[in-house]
């Protein structure tokens, strides 16, 4: 597995990992950190493992956390109701 | 070939439950999402939620959020939607349909032949 | 939810003509620069068939005359040159937002 740079699926990602889009070359897809508390994210981010290529540049929040919304279009991962 | 097969219409009571079936052939099971969506009789499209077939995980419409389940059986490529309290509006079509992976961008690139179901009493 | 209107709600047009569908979301389905709507072709008695996804990108198999634009809360499906075999409804459905919605739907018919 690959644990930090380039990727095109989540399987080549070390744990606790997805395969995202670069923030800095939208073209290339990287090994990115899942969100931890208080990350941005998407909440329609595919959950990990994802056998597709992701488009967003943020990986799902981690496991016990959820993509909710705070105010108009901005999300954050929270601690899951 | 990617095929999506459905079970047949149903005709339930008020009241009732029922669960549809559809089996998924031609391409790796588990490494697709499905969704599922219904279509009232001449109306529009109506999304429902969908299920990752690799682990289980659902996202539902809020709308039929407690009346819904989405489920798979990984062993026969199977996927299953259950609707409770069934009420004459959920007269429809129900149709199963396979996201085609293109990222975030879900899209339903396979569809069921859909599976009718008639809520009357 | 987000809310999506097409416009018109049916079209006739001429064998060989362009058509043109609208459809206009309640809010943007636009997220860092990508936007997130499809659009589907729906025969009778038929399920529906995804012909572009992501806005502008063409499903595989699907001809070249048909095309798609738009951003933010303002889309089009064109049919360059309308087909017999184009008769149909057609919907929008946005899928930056769970639930994800669709258009009313539009039918083209041939004038």
């Known amino acids: 597995a690959v644990i930090t740079g380039a990727c095109d699926k989540d399987s080549q990602c070390g744990g606790g990992m997805c395969c995202a889009v670069s923030i800095w070359v939208k073209s290339i897809r990287i090994c990115t950190p899942m969100g931890k508390l208080g990350d941005s994210c998407h909440p329609l981010t595919r959950k990990v493992p994802f056998f597709g290529r992701r488009m967003h540049h943020t990986c799902p929040c981690l496991p016990g956390l959820a993509c909710l919304r705070t105010s108009f279009n901005r999300f954050i991962c929270l601690a899951q109701k | 070939e990617v095929q999506l097969v459905q079970s047949g219409a149903e005709v339930k009571k008020p009241g009732a439950s029922v669960k549809v079936s559809c089996k998924a052939s031609g391409y790796s099971f588990t490494d697709y999402d499905m969704h599922w969506v219904r279509q009232a009789p001449g109306q529009g499209l109506e999304w429902i939620g969908y299920?990752?077939?690799?682990?289980?995980?659902?996202t539902y419409n809020q709308k039929f959020k407690g009346r819904v389940t989405i489920t798979v059986d990984k062993s026969t490529s199977t996927a299953y939607l259950e609707l409770s309290s069934l009420r004459s509006e959920d007269t429809a079509v129900y149709y199963c349909a396979r996201d085609g992976n293109y990222g975030e961008a879900y899209a339903m690139d396979y569809w069921g032949q859909g599976t009718l179901v008639t809520v009357s009493s | 939810d987000i809310v999506m209107t097409q416009s018109p709600d049916s079209l006739a047009v001429s064998l060989g003509e362009r058509a043109t569908i609208n459809c206009k979301a309640s809010?943007?389905?636009?997220?860092?620069?990508?936007?997130?709507m499809n659009w589907y072709q729906q025969k009778p008695g038929q399920p529906p068939k995804l012909l572009i996804y992501?806005?502008?990108n063409l499903e595989s198999g699907v001809p070249d005359r048909f095309s798609g634009s738009g951003s933010g809360t303002d889309f089009t499906l064109t049919i360059s040159s309308l087909q017999a075999e184009d008769v149909a409804v057609y919907y929008c459905?946005?899928?930056?937002?769970?639930?994800?919605?669709f258009g009313q739907g539009t039918k083209v018919e041939i004038k």
């Open positions: 459905q946005q899928i930056n937002e769970d639930p994800f919605t």
């Open positions: 809010q943007s389905v636009d997220y860092e620069g990508d936007s997130y």
């Open positions: 992501a806005a502008s």
């Open positions: 299920i990752s077939c690799y682990n289980g995980a659902t």
